[in-house]
Interface confidence: medium
């Protein structure tokens, strides 16, 4: 999916109002310096691409993020503010329902959510415009 046409300011507002707090709740008890951020992004569409991948794609050691509160709110925000996003996710959602039975918080998941926090912060950085 190409995130270029999303309403970035609305997604930013959704992140600041709820998603950020849900990410913090998930990471509660974990020191902010425990994980090094290794995933990065250069601009807002790129950040959303990385955020979608880390949030919804199962990875080795962490296959359970899609049912977390922050993931559901992320999906809702993208569905509302990214034209055509919902349609591209129907098949993917069916696959996830079969793959994910239970929510298990592993160290790998904590590391992945730490990466997500970094990506969201980069998504929210003040934009510099060419002058």
């Amino acid at each position: 999916y190409d995130f270029t046409n999303c309403d970035f300011e609305k997604i930013k507002a959704a992140y600041l109002s709820t998603i950020s707090k849900d990410l913090i709740t998930y990471m509660s008890g974990t020191k902010s310096t425990e994980f090094n951020n290794t995933v990065s992004c250069s601009n807002r569409p790129h950040c959303l691409t990385e955020i979608q991948s880390l949030t919804f794609n199962p990875t080795a050691g962490c296959a359970s993020l899609a049912k977390e509160m922050f993931a559901m709110k992320t999906k809702a925000a993208l569905a509302i503010w990214c034209p055509g996003y919902s349609e591209t996710q129907i098949n993917a959602t069916q696959a996830m329902k079969k793959a994910r039975k239970s929510k298990v918080t592993t160290n790998k998941c904590l590391e992945q959510v730490s990466q997500l926090q970094g990506l969201w912060r980069r998504f929210n950085r003040p934009l510099l415009k060419q002058q």
């Epitope: 902010s32 951020n37 990065s40 992004c41 250069s42 601009n43 970094g118 912060r121 980069r122 950085r125 003040p126 934009l127 510099l128 415009k129 060419q130 002058q131």
Partner: antibody, heavy 121, light 105 residues
Framework: EVQLVQSGAEVKKPGASVKVSCKAS????????MNWVRQAPGQRLEWMGI????????SYNQKFKGRVTLTVDKSASTAYMELSSLRSEDTAVYYC??????????????WGQGTTVTVSS | EIVLTQSPATLSLSPGERATLSCRAS?????MHWYQQKPGQAPRPWIY???NLASGVPARFSGSGSGTSYTLTISRLEPEDFAVYYC????????FGGGTKVEIK
């Protein structure tokens, strides 16, 4: 390891221009913004401006607007700060500083070693 | 433009004492960063986003505050802590405070 290596000291006459370079290594240059900060002898740190190497977007301290120009060479992973119409009060150490986004609030996590610019007739 | 005012300008204390550095903003800011600078050196990040210690910073340092009032505290001064500390905001531009010099009494 992230490193910012700046060009050497400069001595300029009033009215001239100076261009300071900042070579970045150890990270993806286009992923982070670059700030320029100066410090006159015995004085506070003074923010001059910021540039996005990704798209060349800039934001300047109003005090320097019109006199300072920030640019980048993406292929060389190098940021530049050019200050024109130099006067004696521009004598200072000029720093480049990478801006970190792994923390809320956008802090400057790595700094160059500084470039001393002396303006004297 | 957001103006940051640091106080006191100079803090004269002995090793082992507690140091409290203040930074006030002319209007509310989301976070405050702190940097340490020693003579002839570039500034070093010391505290990120109000209360997160930078890598290698001893636990005797702490940061707190919100809105327009922020504080850096050193619980027990060690010889290597004597330096100048600057606060910095990034809500509007990137402004620094005037600095507080912590010197040996």
């Amino acid at each position: 390891e992230v490193q910012l290596v700046q060009s050497g000291a400069e001595v300029k006459k009033p009215g001239a221009s100076v261009k300071v370079s900042c070579k970045a290594s150890g990270y993806t240059f286009t992923d982070d913004y670059m700030n320029w900060v100066r410090q006159a002898p015995g004085q506070r740190l003074e923010w001059m401006g910021i540039i996005s190497p990704y798209n060349g977007g800039t934001s300047y301290n109003q005090k320097f607007k019109g006199r300072v120009t920030l640019t980048v060479d993406k292929s060389a992973s190098t940021a530049y700060m050019e200050l024109s119409s130099l006067r004696s009060e521009d004598t200072a150490v000029y720093y480049c500083a990478r801006e970190d986004y792994d923390y809320d609030g956008y802090a400057m996590d790595y700094w160059g070693q500084g470039t001393t610019v002396t303006v004297s007739s | 433009e957001i103006v940051l005012t640091q106080s006191p300008a100079t803090l004269s204390l002995s090793p082992g004492e507690r140091a409290t550095l203040s930074c006030r903003a002319s209007s509310s800011v989301s976070y405050m960063h702190w940097y340490q600078q020693k003579p002839g050196q570039a500034p070093r990040p010391w505290i990120y986003a109000t209360s997160n210690l930078a890598s290698g910073v001893p636990a005797r340092f702490s940061g707190s505050g919100s809105g327009t009032s922020y504080t850096l505290t050193i619980s027990r001064l060690e010889p290597e802590d004597f330096a100048v500390y600057y606060c910095q905001q990034s809500d509007s531009g990137r402004e620094f405070g005037g600095g507080t010099k912590v010197e040996i009494k």
